[in-house]
Protein backbone atom coordinates (compact mmCIF):
# COMPACT_ATOMS: atom_id res chain seq x y z
CA UNK A 1 0.00 0.00 0.00
CA UNK A 2 1.41 3.05 -0.98
CA UNK A 3 -0.14 5.01 1.59
CA UNK A 4 2.52 3.08 4.16
CA UNK A 5 5.19 4.36 2.40
CA UNK A 6 4.54 7.83 3.75
CA UNK A 7 5.68 8.73 7.53
CA UNK A 8 5.58 12.14 9.43
CA UNK A 9 8.58 14.19 9.72
CA UNK A 10 8.78 16.27 12.60
CA UNK A 11 9.68 20.32 11.99
CA UNK A 12 12.12 21.60 14.65
CA UNK A 13 13.37 24.37 15.18
CA UNK A 14 16.97 23.78 14.54
CA UNK A 15 19.28 23.94 11.79
CA UNK A 16 17.84 26.07 9.35
CA UNK A 17 16.42 29.43 9.70
CA UNK A 18 12.86 30.06 9.02
CA UNK A 19 11.09 29.49 5.54
CA UNK A 20 9.05 31.79 4.53
CA UNK A 21 7.03 31.62 1.37
CA UNK A 22 5.51 34.10 -0.74
CA UNK A 23 2.39 32.20 -2.14
CA UNK A 24 1.09 28.65 -0.61
CA UNK A 25 2.09 26.86 -3.99
CA UNK A 26 5.44 27.48 -3.65
CA UNK A 27 5.10 25.05 -1.29
CA UNK A 28 3.70 22.11 -3.52
CA UNK A 29 6.19 19.21 -4.42
CA UNK A 30 7.05 19.56 -8.07
CA UNK A 31 4.09 17.70 -10.28
CA UNK A 32 4.96 16.31 -13.90
CA UNK A 33 1.12 15.46 -13.81
CA UNK A 34 0.32 12.44 -15.81
CA UNK A 35 0.71 13.13 -19.49
CA UNK A 36 3.83 12.08 -21.54
CA UNK A 37 5.36 15.39 -22.74
CA UNK A 38 8.49 16.98 -22.11
CA UNK A 39 8.91 20.44 -21.53
CA UNK A 40 11.24 22.66 -19.56
CA UNK A 41 9.35 24.29 -16.36
CA UNK A 42 10.81 25.78 -12.79
CA UNK A 43 9.46 24.89 -9.28
CA UNK A 44 10.59 26.46 -6.46
CA UNK A 45 11.96 23.52 -4.23
CA UNK A 46 11.49 24.11 -0.14
CA UNK A 47 14.26 22.15 0.65
CA UNK A 48 16.91 24.06 -1.24
CA UNK A 49 15.29 27.15 -1.13
CA UNK A 50 16.23 27.86 -4.75
CA UNK A 51 14.11 27.51 -8.12
CA UNK A 52 15.18 24.57 -9.90
CA UNK A 53 14.09 23.05 -13.64
CA UNK A 54 12.15 19.99 -14.08
CA UNK A 55 10.22 18.48 -16.78
CA UNK A 56 6.16 18.82 -17.27
CA UNK A 57 4.14 16.46 -18.85
CA UNK A 58 2.27 19.12 -20.02
CA UNK A 59 -1.33 18.47 -18.01
CA UNK A 60 -2.31 18.36 -14.71
CA UNK A 61 0.39 19.13 -12.21
CA UNK A 62 -0.37 21.37 -9.78
CA UNK A 63 0.78 25.60 -9.78
CA UNK A 64 3.96 25.77 -8.46
CA UNK A 65 5.30 25.71 -12.21
CA UNK A 66 6.81 28.41 -13.97
CA UNK A 67 7.87 28.84 -17.57
CA UNK A 68 11.17 30.51 -16.26
CA UNK A 69 12.96 30.97 -13.59
CA UNK A 70 13.28 34.19 -13.22
CA UNK A 71 9.27 33.64 -13.31
CA UNK A 72 9.53 31.26 -10.13
CA UNK A 73 12.52 33.30 -8.54
CA UNK A 74 9.74 36.74 -8.74
CA UNK A 75 7.11 34.47 -6.99
CA UNK A 76 8.80 32.08 -4.86
CA UNK A 77 11.87 33.60 -3.66
CA UNK A 78 12.63 36.04 -0.21
CA UNK A 79 14.36 38.50 -2.52
CA UNK A 80 11.53 39.76 -3.89
CA UNK A 81 9.94 39.88 -0.71
CA UNK A 82 9.67 44.00 -0.61
CA UNK A 83 8.68 44.32 -3.65
CA UNK A 84 5.64 41.66 -3.43
CA UNK A 85 4.61 42.98 -0.15
CA UNK A 86 4.86 46.52 -1.34
CA UNK A 87 2.97 45.98 -4.31
CA UNK A 88 0.63 43.76 -2.18
CA UNK A 89 -1.27 47.00 -2.03
CA UNK A 90 -2.22 47.30 -5.41
CA UNK A 91 -1.32 43.39 -6.08
CA UNK A 92 -2.43 41.55 -9.30
CA UNK A 93 -4.75 38.95 -9.20
CA UNK A 94 -3.56 35.35 -9.62
CA UNK A 95 -3.67 35.23 -13.89
CA UNK A 96 -6.11 32.61 -13.74
CA UNK A 97 -8.69 34.86 -12.59
CA UNK A 98 -8.47 36.49 -15.95
CA UNK A 99 -9.46 33.50 -17.93
CA UNK A 100 -13.03 33.46 -19.67
CA UNK A 101 -15.53 31.09 -17.42
CA UNK A 102 -15.43 27.54 -19.16
CA UNK A 103 -18.17 24.92 -18.57
CA UNK A 104 -15.28 22.66 -19.77
CA UNK A 105 -16.72 19.51 -22.30
CA UNK A 106 -18.59 17.23 -19.65
CA UNK A 107 -22.45 17.55 -19.15
CA UNK A 108 -22.94 17.18 -15.65
CA UNK A 109 -24.40 20.52 -14.88
CA UNK A 110 -23.45 22.58 -11.66
CA UNK A 111 -23.31 26.06 -10.62
CA UNK A 112 -19.90 27.35 -9.70
CA UNK A 113 -18.34 30.75 -9.50
CA UNK A 114 -15.98 32.46 -11.87
CA UNK A 115 -14.43 36.12 -11.98
CA UNK A 116 -15.47 38.40 -14.28
CA UNK A 117 -13.07 40.61 -15.27
CA UNK A 118 -15.96 42.79 -17.53
CA UNK A 119 -17.49 43.40 -14.16
CA UNK A 120 -15.06 42.99 -11.82
CA UNK A 121 -16.72 40.85 -9.69
CA UNK A 122 -17.28 36.89 -8.94
CA UNK A 123 -20.38 35.64 -10.67
CA UNK A 124 -21.93 32.06 -10.96
CA UNK A 125 -21.83 29.89 -13.69
CA UNK A 126 -22.78 26.69 -15.24
CA UNK A 127 -19.71 24.46 -15.48
CA UNK A 128 -20.09 20.90 -16.53
CA UNK A 129 -18.15 18.92 -13.94
CA UNK A 130 -14.79 18.11 -15.22
CA UNK A 131 -11.46 20.18 -17.00
CA UNK A 132 -12.64 24.09 -17.63
CA UNK A 133 -9.73 26.06 -16.15
CA UNK A 134 -8.93 27.38 -12.79
CA UNK A 135 -11.26 30.25 -12.55
CA UNK A 136 -14.09 27.82 -11.48
CA UNK A 137 -14.43 27.71 -7.30
CA UNK A 138 -17.14 26.23 -5.45
CA UNK A 139 -18.23 29.07 -3.07
CA UNK A 140 -18.55 33.31 -4.15
CA UNK A 141 -16.68 33.15 -0.80
CA UNK A 142 -13.63 31.35 -2.26
CA UNK A 143 -13.52 33.34 -5.64
CA UNK A 144 -13.94 36.52 -3.58
CA UNK A 145 -11.53 35.84 -1.50
CA UNK A 146 -9.07 34.94 -4.31
CA UNK A 147 -9.78 37.08 -6.98
CA UNK A 148 -12.11 40.22 -6.15
CA UNK A 149 -10.06 43.16 -4.71
CA UNK A 150 -10.25 43.28 -1.18
CA UNK A 151 -11.48 46.48 0.60
CA UNK A 152 -7.86 48.32 1.50
CA UNK A 153 -7.20 47.51 -2.47
CA UNK A 154 -4.87 44.16 -1.54
CA UNK A 155 -5.76 41.03 -2.77
CA UNK A 156 -8.07 39.21 0.09
CA UNK A 157 -6.80 35.81 0.63
CA UNK A 158 -8.10 32.70 0.71
CA UNK A 159 -4.76 30.03 1.43
CA UNK A 160 -4.93 30.07 4.87
CA UNK A 161 -5.52 27.25 6.76
CA UNK A 162 -6.81 26.19 9.85
CA UNK A 163 -6.76 23.36 12.28
CA UNK A 164 -10.70 21.95 12.68
CA UNK A 165 -10.79 21.06 16.53
CA UNK A 166 -13.50 19.30 16.06
CA UNK A 167 -12.28 16.30 12.99
CA UNK A 168 -8.18 17.23 12.97
CA UNK A 169 -9.31 18.22 9.56
CA UNK A 170 -7.71 21.02 7.74
CA UNK A 171 -9.90 23.78 6.27
CA UNK A 172 -9.54 26.95 4.27
CA UNK A 173 -9.55 29.89 6.13
CA UNK A 174 -10.03 33.17 4.67
CA UNK A 175 -7.03 35.88 5.79
CA UNK A 176 -7.81 39.37 5.86
CA UNK A 177 -4.80 40.55 4.88
CA UNK A 178 -1.57 38.80 2.71
CA UNK A 179 0.20 36.01 4.40
CA UNK A 180 3.90 34.74 3.91
CA UNK A 181 3.31 31.22 4.41
CA UNK A 182 -0.05 29.73 3.36
CA UNK A 183 0.31 26.38 2.93
CA UNK A 184 -2.97 25.11 1.60
CA UNK A 185 -3.42 21.24 -1.13
CA UNK A 186 -6.15 22.08 -3.76
CA UNK A 187 -9.36 22.51 -2.40
CA UNK A 188 -11.07 20.00 -4.35
CA UNK A 189 -9.23 17.48 -1.77
CA UNK A 190 -11.59 19.15 0.79
CA UNK A 191 -14.49 18.28 -0.71
CA UNK A 192 -16.77 15.40 0.14
CA UNK A 193 -17.21 12.37 -2.52
CA UNK A 194 -19.73 13.43 -5.31
CA UNK A 195 -21.11 10.02 -7.23
CA UNK A 196 -22.48 12.92 -9.71
CA UNK A 197 -25.81 12.61 -11.54
CA UNK A 198 -25.29 9.83 -14.15
CA UNK A 199 -26.22 5.96 -13.83
CA UNK A 200 -23.12 4.40 -13.98
CA UNK A 201 -21.17 2.50 -11.28
CA UNK A 202 -17.24 3.12 -12.02
CA UNK A 203 -14.50 2.67 -9.60
CA UNK A 204 -13.23 6.01 -8.37
CA UNK A 205 -11.13 7.12 -5.40
CA UNK A 206 -11.43 10.66 -3.56
CA UNK A 207 -9.40 11.92 -0.54
CA UNK A 208 -11.25 11.77 2.50
CA UNK A 209 -9.80 15.18 4.35
CA UNK A 210 -10.84 13.67 7.82
CA UNK A 211 -8.94 10.54 7.76
CA UNK A 212 -6.27 11.70 5.74
CA UNK A 213 -6.65 8.86 3.56
CA UNK A 214 -7.76 8.04 0.07
CA UNK A 215 -11.22 5.94 -0.08
CA UNK A 216 -12.92 4.05 -2.74
CA UNK A 217 -16.23 5.18 -4.22
CA UNK A 218 -18.82 4.70 -7.12
CA UNK A 219 -18.68 7.35 -9.64
CA UNK A 220 -22.17 7.42 -11.95
CA UNK A 221 -19.88 8.84 -14.72
CA UNK A 222 -21.00 12.09 -14.84
CA UNK A 223 -21.15 15.79 -13.06
CA UNK A 224 -19.11 15.66 -9.16
CA UNK A 225 -16.45 17.44 -7.93
CA UNK A 226 -12.88 17.57 -8.86
CA UNK A 227 -12.15 15.05 -5.93
CA UNK A 228 -12.34 12.15 -7.95
CA UNK A 229 -9.09 9.83 -9.55
CA UNK A 230 -9.13 6.68 -11.46
CA UNK A 231 -6.26 5.48 -9.36
CA UNK A 232 -5.55 5.19 -5.48
CA UNK A 233 -1.93 6.40 -6.17
CA UNK A 234 -3.13 9.19 -8.53
CA UNK A 235 -5.08 10.26 -5.46
CA UNK A 236 -2.51 10.39 -3.44
CA UNK A 237 -0.18 11.99 -5.45
CA UNK A 238 -2.71 14.98 -5.42
CA UNK A 239 -3.89 15.20 -2.47
CA UNK A 240 -2.15 13.52 0.13
CA UNK A 241 1.62 15.31 -0.36
CA UNK A 242 2.00 18.51 0.89
CA UNK A 243 -1.27 18.92 4.05
CA UNK A 244 -0.41 19.60 7.18
CA UNK A 245 -1.44 17.38 9.52
CA UNK A 246 -1.12 19.19 12.56
CA UNK A 247 -0.35 22.96 12.78
CA UNK A 248 1.99 23.90 16.06
CA UNK A 249 5.51 25.15 16.87
CA UNK A 250 6.84 21.20 16.22
CA UNK A 251 3.95 20.74 13.36
CA UNK A 252 3.78 17.62 11.22
CA UNK A 253 4.39 17.82 7.63
CA UNK A 254 3.64 14.64 5.46
CA UNK A 255 6.86 13.62 3.04
CA UNK A 256 7.88 10.28 1.17
CA UNK A 257 10.23 7.76 3.04
CA UNK A 258 12.06 7.88 -0.08
CA UNK A 259 12.87 11.21 0.16
CA UNK A 260 15.65 12.15 2.36
CA UNK A 261 14.44 13.28 6.02
CA UNK A 262 15.36 17.40 6.30
CA UNK A 263 14.52 19.73 9.09
CA UNK A 264 12.20 22.36 8.53
CA UNK A 265 11.24 25.50 10.28
CA UNK A 266 8.05 27.06 9.04
CA UNK A 267 7.31 30.46 9.72
CA UNK A 268 4.15 31.67 9.94
CA UNK A 269 3.78 35.45 9.40
CA UNK A 270 1.96 37.90 8.30
CA UNK A 271 1.92 41.50 7.35
CA UNK A 272 -0.61 43.99 9.16
CA UNK A 273 -0.80 46.49 6.71
CA UNK A 274 -0.83 50.07 8.09
CA UNK A 275 -2.04 53.22 6.67
CA UNK A 276 0.28 55.03 4.76
CA UNK B 1 -38.89 50.88 -7.47
CA UNK B 2 -37.89 47.51 -9.61
CA UNK B 3 -40.90 46.83 -12.02
CA UNK B 4 -40.92 43.81 -14.67
CA UNK B 5 -44.14 44.27 -16.95
CA UNK B 6 -44.96 41.18 -19.10
CA UNK B 7 -46.83 41.46 -22.20
CA UNK B 8 -50.54 40.32 -22.58
CA UNK B 9 -51.60 37.00 -23.33
CA UNK B 10 -51.96 34.85 -26.34
CA UNK B 11 -53.77 32.63 -27.90
CA UNK B 12 -51.78 30.33 -30.52
CA UNK B 13 -52.33 27.15 -32.69
CA UNK B 14 -50.23 23.95 -32.54
CA UNK B 15 -47.13 24.15 -33.95
CA UNK B 16 -47.04 27.99 -34.35
CA UNK B 17 -44.43 30.18 -32.38
CA UNK B 18 -45.27 33.22 -29.40
CA UNK B 19 -42.55 35.76 -28.43
CA UNK B 20 -43.42 37.03 -25.34
CA UNK B 21 -42.00 40.36 -23.87
CA UNK B 22 -40.45 41.65 -20.14
CA UNK B 23 -39.48 45.20 -19.78
CA UNK B 24 -38.05 46.20 -16.76
CA UNK B 25 -37.28 49.42 -14.88
CA UNK B 26 -35.88 50.35 -11.38
CA UNK B 27 -32.79 48.78 -12.05
CA UNK B 28 -29.92 48.38 -13.96
CA UNK B 29 -31.04 45.85 -16.41
CA UNK B 30 -27.60 44.16 -17.46
CA UNK B 31 -26.33 43.68 -14.28
CA UNK B 32 -28.74 41.00 -13.46
CA UNK B 33 -29.60 38.13 -15.34
CA UNK B 34 -33.59 37.33 -16.41
CA UNK B 35 -34.81 34.38 -15.79
CA UNK B 36 -37.81 32.23 -17.88
CA UNK B 37 -40.73 30.44 -15.69
CA UNK B 38 -43.98 28.78 -16.64
CA UNK B 39 -46.85 27.61 -14.80
CA UNK B 40 -49.26 25.09 -16.50
CA UNK B 41 -52.68 25.10 -14.70
CA UNK B 42 -52.67 23.60 -11.57
CA UNK B 43 -49.59 22.39 -11.93
CA UNK B 44 -45.51 23.51 -10.53
CA UNK B 45 -43.11 26.18 -11.90
CA UNK B 46 -40.94 24.75 -14.54
CA UNK B 47 -37.32 27.09 -15.03
CA UNK B 48 -37.00 27.21 -18.60
CA UNK B 49 -33.71 29.50 -18.99
CA UNK B 50 -31.82 32.81 -17.86
CA UNK B 51 -30.66 35.42 -19.99
CA UNK B 52 -27.59 38.02 -18.49
CA UNK B 53 -27.69 41.14 -20.98
CA UNK B 54 -24.32 42.72 -20.84
CA UNK B 55 -22.43 39.63 -22.00
CA UNK B 56 -25.55 37.48 -23.27
CA UNK B 57 -24.68 34.93 -21.71
CA UNK B 58 -27.65 32.30 -21.66
CA UNK B 59 -28.76 28.99 -20.09
CA UNK B 60 -31.35 26.79 -20.77
CA UNK B 61 -32.56 24.17 -19.56
CA UNK B 62 -31.70 20.87 -21.99
CA UNK B 63 -35.94 20.27 -22.15
CA UNK B 64 -36.38 23.52 -23.59
CA UNK B 65 -32.88 24.35 -25.41
CA UNK B 66 -34.13 23.53 -29.09
CA UNK B 67 -37.62 25.45 -29.09
CA UNK B 68 -37.41 28.40 -26.49
CA UNK B 69 -34.96 31.50 -27.57
CA UNK B 70 -34.21 34.07 -25.07
CA UNK B 71 -33.19 37.54 -26.20
CA UNK B 72 -32.52 40.96 -24.59
CA UNK B 73 -32.55 44.34 -26.04
CA UNK B 74 -30.38 46.24 -23.79
CA UNK B 75 -31.61 49.90 -25.10
CA UNK B 76 -34.86 49.37 -23.86
CA UNK B 77 -34.51 47.11 -21.17
CA UNK B 78 -36.63 44.41 -22.31
CA UNK B 79 -35.96 40.56 -22.37
CA UNK B 80 -37.85 38.38 -24.44
CA UNK B 81 -38.35 34.69 -25.22
CA UNK B 82 -39.39 33.08 -28.18
CA UNK B 83 -40.93 29.26 -28.26
CA UNK B 84 -41.62 27.40 -31.29
CA UNK B 85 -43.59 24.45 -32.50
CA UNK B 86 -45.91 24.80 -29.68
CA UNK B 87 -48.34 22.69 -28.67
CA UNK B 88 -51.55 21.85 -26.18
CA UNK B 89 -48.85 21.20 -23.29
CA UNK B 90 -47.17 24.09 -23.72
CA UNK B 91 -50.55 26.07 -22.31
CA UNK B 92 -49.48 27.78 -18.98
CA UNK B 93 -48.63 30.90 -17.70
CA UNK B 94 -45.08 32.52 -18.39
CA UNK B 95 -43.38 34.58 -15.79
CA UNK B 96 -40.34 36.47 -15.80
CA UNK B 97 -38.22 36.91 -13.24
CA UNK B 98 -34.53 38.87 -12.37
CA UNK B 99 -31.83 37.33 -9.97
CA UNK B 100 -28.43 38.97 -8.88
CA UNK B 101 -25.18 37.30 -10.20
CA UNK B 102 -24.66 35.74 -7.86
CA UNK B 103 -27.23 33.69 -6.92
CA UNK B 104 -30.51 32.65 -8.14
CA UNK B 105 -32.80 34.22 -5.77
CA UNK B 106 -35.31 35.43 -8.19
CA UNK B 107 -36.66 38.66 -5.66
CA UNK B 108 -38.97 40.56 -8.76
CA UNK B 109 -41.31 38.45 -10.90
CA UNK B 110 -43.39 39.71 -13.91
CA UNK B 111 -47.45 40.03 -13.35
CA UNK B 112 -47.42 36.44 -15.74
CA UNK B 113 -48.56 36.37 -19.67
CA UNK B 114 -51.16 33.56 -20.25
CA UNK B 115 -50.28 31.66 -23.36
CA UNK B 116 -53.25 29.57 -24.75
CA UNK B 117 -52.24 26.26 -27.22
CA UNK B 118 -55.32 25.26 -29.34
CA UNK B 119 -56.40 24.60 -32.23
CA UNK C 1 -31.75 16.74 -13.20
CA UNK C 2 -32.72 16.91 -9.27
CA UNK C 3 -36.34 16.14 -8.48
CA UNK C 4 -37.43 17.73 -5.77
CA UNK C 5 -40.41 16.37 -4.06
CA UNK C 6 -42.63 18.27 -1.75
CA UNK C 7 -44.81 16.49 1.29
CA UNK C 8 -47.46 16.62 1.69
CA UNK C 9 -49.50 17.81 -1.64
CA UNK C 10 -51.89 19.70 0.51
CA UNK C 11 -51.78 20.76 4.00
CA UNK C 12 -54.88 21.17 5.63
CA UNK C 13 -54.68 23.07 9.30
CA UNK C 14 -56.19 25.73 10.97
CA UNK C 15 -55.10 29.33 12.35
CA UNK C 16 -52.64 28.67 15.56
CA UNK C 17 -51.41 25.35 14.49
CA UNK C 18 -47.83 24.45 13.37
CA UNK C 19 -46.90 23.69 9.83
CA UNK C 20 -44.13 21.62 8.85
CA UNK C 21 -43.47 21.12 4.79
CA UNK C 22 -40.75 18.83 3.46
CA UNK C 23 -39.12 19.10 0.22
CA UNK C 24 -37.20 15.83 -0.45
CA UNK C 25 -34.31 16.09 -3.50
CA UNK C 26 -33.49 13.03 -5.50
CA UNK C 27 -29.75 14.29 -5.08
CA UNK C 28 -27.62 15.86 -2.53
CA UNK C 29 -27.97 19.53 -2.88
CA UNK C 30 -26.12 22.18 -0.77
CA UNK C 31 -28.16 23.98 1.59
CA UNK C 32 -26.84 27.47 0.16
CA UNK C 33 -28.81 26.35 -2.87
CA UNK C 34 -32.38 25.82 -1.17
CA UNK C 35 -34.84 27.97 -2.02
CA UNK C 36 -38.24 28.56 -0.69
CA UNK C 37 -40.90 30.52 -2.70
CA UNK C 38 -44.58 31.93 -1.38
CA UNK C 39 -47.62 31.87 -4.05
CA UNK C 40 -51.20 32.85 -3.74
CA UNK C 41 -53.79 32.40 -6.01
CA UNK C 42 -53.62 34.96 -9.15
CA UNK C 43 -49.84 35.75 -8.02
CA UNK C 44 -46.58 35.27 -9.39
CA UNK C 45 -44.72 33.41 -6.74
CA UNK C 46 -42.71 35.73 -4.05
CA UNK C 47 -39.04 34.55 -2.64
CA UNK C 48 -39.55 33.65 0.78
CA UNK C 49 -36.45 31.69 2.02
CA UNK C 50 -33.31 31.66 0.86
CA UNK C 51 -30.08 29.33 1.82
CA UNK C 52 -32.30 26.93 3.43
CA UNK C 53 -32.87 29.35 6.45
CA UNK C 54 -32.80 32.97 5.71
CA UNK C 55 -35.64 34.89 5.54
CA UNK C 56 -36.43 37.33 2.97
CA UNK C 57 -37.32 40.87 3.57
CA UNK C 58 -40.76 41.26 4.95
CA UNK C 59 -41.43 37.45 5.76
CA UNK C 60 -42.50 37.14 9.55
CA UNK C 61 -40.56 35.52 12.45
CA UNK C 62 -42.84 32.60 12.80
CA UNK C 63 -41.40 31.02 9.49
CA UNK C 64 -38.20 29.10 9.66
CA UNK C 65 -35.98 26.70 7.21
CA UNK C 66 -33.80 23.73 8.47
CA UNK C 67 -32.44 20.71 6.23
CA UNK C 68 -29.23 19.73 4.48
CA UNK C 69 -28.30 16.90 1.97
CA UNK C 70 -31.34 15.87 0.65
CA UNK C 71 -34.14 16.59 3.27
CA UNK C 72 -35.03 19.98 4.02
CA UNK C 73 -38.21 22.27 5.48
CA UNK C 74 -39.79 24.75 6.36
CA UNK C 75 -41.82 25.16 9.68
CA UNK C 76 -44.51 27.54 10.40
CA UNK C 77 -44.67 27.61 13.92
CA UNK C 78 -48.37 29.18 14.41
CA UNK C 79 -50.25 30.12 11.20
CA UNK C 80 -51.63 33.18 10.77
CA UNK C 81 -54.56 33.53 8.18
CA UNK C 82 -52.13 34.84 5.43
CA UNK C 83 -49.48 32.38 5.95
CA UNK C 84 -52.21 29.74 3.69
CA UNK C 85 -50.63 29.59 0.37
CA UNK C 86 -48.83 27.26 -2.09
CA UNK C 87 -45.03 27.18 -1.03
CA UNK C 88 -42.49 25.55 -3.72
CA UNK C 89 -38.69 24.41 -3.31
CA UNK C 90 -36.14 25.24 -5.51
CA UNK C 91 -32.69 23.96 -6.21
CA UNK C 92 -29.75 25.83 -8.05
CA UNK C 93 -26.87 23.72 -7.44
CA UNK C 94 -27.49 21.83 -10.47
CA UNK C 95 -29.01 22.29 -14.06
CA UNK C 96 -31.66 23.09 -14.79
CA UNK C 97 -32.48 24.63 -12.06
CA UNK C 98 -36.06 22.76 -10.30
CA UNK C 99 -38.86 23.43 -8.19
CA UNK C 100 -40.90 20.90 -6.08
CA UNK C 101 -44.27 20.64 -7.16
CA UNK C 102 -45.23 22.80 -4.36
CA UNK C 103 -47.35 22.20 -1.05
CA UNK C 104 -50.82 23.44 -0.73
CA UNK C 105 -51.07 24.78 3.25
CA UNK C 106 -55.14 25.05 2.93
CA UNK C 107 -57.48 26.42 5.99
CA UNK C 108 -59.23 23.54 7.70
Known amino acids: DSEEDEEHTIITDTELPPLKLMHSFCAFKADDGPCKAIMKRFFFNIFTRQCEEFIYGGCEGNQNRFESLEECKKMCTRDNANRIIKTTLQQEKPDFCFLEEDPGICRGYITRYFYNNQTKQCERFKYGGCLGNMNNFETLEECKNICEDGPNGFQVDNYGTQLNAVNNSLTPQSTKVPSLFEFHGPSWCLTPADRGLCRANENRFYYNSVIGKCRPFKYSGCGGNENNFTSKQECLRACKKGFIQRISKGGLIKTKRKRKKQRVKIAYEEIFVKNM | EVQLVQSGAELKKPGASVKLSCKASGYTFTSYWMHWVRQAPGQGLEWIGEIKPDQGRIDYNEKFKTRATLTADKSTSTAYMELSSLRSEDTAVYYC????????????WGQGTTVTVSS | EIVLTQSPATLSLSPGERATLSCSASSSVSSSYLYWYQQKPGQAPRLWISGTSILASGVPARFSGSGSGTKYTLTISSLEPEDFAVYFCHQWSHYPFTFGQGTKLEIK
Open chain 2, 97 to 108: ARSSVVDVAMDY
